[in-house]
């Protein structure tokens, strides 16, 4: 036999096993130009001293071979005595280490069977009532063809599917979409209504993200706040990476999830921009305020599960930074400036009462005064901090008030609000004897103390009714009572306590009279 | 000259097997396609399986899962394993090659 022909002789090696794991198999056979063909096919197992023949059954029920060799493409005319017009029937056997494999057949009319491409080019993948749709377009020249498809997930092997016929300039399909694994999808195709035609070679691999993106663990941190009223927010745990099915690890576009930090500052509810979203790979800093952090993960498909934390406020407080004057026309306070044209936000609430209820004003961008202050004041008629009770300021900064990462914390303290001089009078002022020539006086607490860091101290002034005389005893903030000593048998004393504060004098409170009795001996 | 010679047909009970041979000269079975046909008196005569180069099988629907055709390449004879046999099995069964057809035997299934 010549060896661009088929042989009609029997192949120069024993009958054909039936199947085995490895051998000959997807054998595809196309006319590639006006007058000739070509088959080729895949080879499984070692490749060492095989012979391939390519098997061919005319519809005459004659039968012929070609002798391959160690290749797996062979091409042949129309005149090497296979019938192109009418069906005939195609298989590969192998000889190798003393046994024949043979591939599954295909039955075609040779002259009809055009090679077709797998879908080339860039594959759409988009959700469709909870499945997955693919869309590309047709390859050139290949309107009209059967399409199939193959998937598997990290843990499954390849299960086939079908996408049914397609007839346009575009082709489509409908494929299972996964809720918590990625999969990886492979198409082909064939010739529409041409018996037997070959299918394409599978399509490079469409990785796909499962319907809901993995929830992210992750754990933050936060520093302490720094001296530029700065915390860093630190990422303790990375969120768990999907796990990807063999064809998709490495690089796998599309089944990528992105994580995003979406910040929402819960302080100073005046200012322009409570939200940012960020990268998750892109750790901000924070003011001291209180925040509430979610990571949202998501894909092609969209968002999924999101995870919030709260990461309350920083409170440490600065008892001195703040200088608050009292005036008949309002109020002035006076701290340390930051820069030049910074906006300060300056939120209050009274203390003991929910979050929710803070109150806040925002300056105009400012420059330090001479003095190197900045200042916010406010009318006795704005109502600001007009009650009498304790209040807790925070004072914040920023550059650019519209970028919420760049506020920074300038002091937290507390102020007593209204007229805290007269408020903070000491009640309940009692004296009692405690030897020949001293007494205790004692009196309720300030509402004052119930304001960290505003009393200064207390003052208790005693005076001798007889010469006049005059003596002042200041008092810790944390004590109410104090010993008064020297004083004489007899004589009319009124004693009086004050409760002042670093800016303020106190108002006294009402006069107590009192003598220690003279004591007559026996 | 070709030549194709049927052998193994007989009664046998419902459910019953048969093997029957089909000798081949003058053609090679592993170059030619070998056919089995059966036909009942008054039918049409229907194919019942194919071997194609001594390796490719085909089976008609009816007997898928029950016949098994196979080839002997050093005998050059093809056979047809008939199991779970019924009685609508009961026919002429001839194999043909090329356009050459032996004379047939005779299968008969009934209890």
């Known amino acids: 036999c010549r060896t661009s022909e088929c042989c009609f002789q029997d192949p120069p090696y024993p009958d054909a096993d039936s199947g085995s794991a490895s051998g000959p198999r997807d054998l595809r056979c196309y006319r590639i130009s006006s007058d000739r063909y070509e088959c080729s096919w895949q080879y499984e197992g070692p490749t060492a001293g095989v012979s391939h023949f390519l098997r061919c059954c005319l519809s005459s029920g004659r039968c012929c071979y070609f002798a391959a060799g160690s290749a797996t493409r062979l091409q042949f005319s129309d005149q090497a005595g296979v019938s192109v017009l009418y069906t005939v029937t195609l298989w590969v056997e192998s000889w190798a280490r003393n046994q024949t494999e043979k591939s599954p057949e295909v039955t075609l009319q040779l002259y009809n069977s055009v090679k077709y491409e797998p879908p080339l080019g860039d594959i759409k993948v988009s959700k469709l009532a909870g499945q997955l749709r693919m869309e590309w377009e047709t390859p050139d020249n290949q309107v009209g063809a059967e399409v199939q498809f193959r998937h598997r997930t990290p843990s499954s092997p390849w299960k086939l599917g079908d996408c049914g016929p397609q007839d346009d300039d575009t082709e489509s399909c409908l494929c299972p979409l996964e809720m918590n694994v990625a999969q990886e999808f492979q198409l082909r195709r064939r010739q529409l209504g041409s018996q037997g035609s070959s299918w394409s070679k599978w399509s490079s691999p469409v990785c796909v993200p499962p319907e809901n993106p993995p929830q992210p663990q992750v754990r933050f941190s936060v520093e302490q706040l720094g001296q530029d009223g700065r915390r860093r927010l630190t990422l303790k745990e990375q969120p768990t990476q999907l796990e990807l099915p063999e064809g998709c690890q490495g690089l796998a576009p599309g089944t990528e999830v992105t994580y995003r930090l979406q910040l929402h500052m819960l302080s100073c509810p005046c200012k322009a921009k409570a939200t940012r979203t960020l990268h998750l790979g892109k750790m901000p800093y924070l003011s001291g305020a209180a925040y509430n952090v979610a990571v949202i993960s998501s894909n092609q498909f969209g968002p999924g599960l999101n995870q919030t934390w709260h990461i309350p406020a920083d409170t440490h407080t600065e008892p001195v930074a703040l200088n608050i004057s009292v005036g008949t026309n309002g109020t002035t306070m006076y701290w340390p400036a930051r820069a030049q044209s910074m906006t300060y936000c300056i939120e209050w609430q009274p203390v003991g009462q929910d979050g929710g209820l803070a109150t806040c004003s925002l300056t105009a961008p400012q420059d330090p005064d001479p003095a190197g202050m900045a200042t916010y004041s406010w009318s006795r008629e704005s109502g600001a901090m007009g009650q009498e009770k304790c209040y807790y300021i925070t004072i914040f900064a920023s550059a650019h008030p519209e970028k919420l990462t760049l506020w920074s914390t300038v002091l937290s303290t507390y102020h007593f609000g209204g007229n805290a001089s007269a408020a903070g009078t000491p009640h309940h002022v009692s004296v009692k004897n405690h030897s020949l020539d001293s007494v205790s006086v004692d009196w309720a607490p300030s509402l004052l103390s119930t304001c960290p860091g505003v009393l200064k101290e207390y003052v208790v002034r005693c005076r001798d009714e007889d010469s006049k005389q005059v003596s002042e005893h200041p008092v810790q903030p944390t004590e109410t009572q104090v010993t008064l000593s020297g004083l004489r048998a007899g004589v009319a004393y009124t004693v009086q306590v004050r409760a002042d504060t670093a800016w303020l004098r106190g108002v006294w409170s009402q006069p107590q009279r009192f003598s220690i009795e003279v004591q007559v001996s026996d | 000259e070709v030549q194709l010679v049927e052998s193994g047909g007989g009664l046998v009970q419902p459910g019953g097997s048969l093997r029957l041979s089909c000798a081949v000269s003058?053609?090679?079975?592993?170059?030619?396609?070998v056919n089995w046909y059966r036909q009942a008196p008054g039918k049409q005569r229907e194919l019942v399986a194919l071997?194609?180069?001594?390796?490719?099988?085909k089976y008609a629907d009816d007997v898928k899962g029950r016949f098994t055709i196979s080839s002997d390449s050093a005998r050059n004879t093809v056979y047809l394993q008939m199991n779970s046999l019924r009685p609508e099995d009961t026919a002429v069964y001839s194999c043909?090659?090329?356009?050459?057809w032996g004379q047939g035997t005779q299968v008969t299934v009934s209890s």
């Open positions: 043909s090659a090329l356009e050459y």
């Open positions: 003058g053609i090679s079975v592993r170059s030619s396609v």
């Open positions: 071997i194609m180069g001594g390796a490719i099988t």
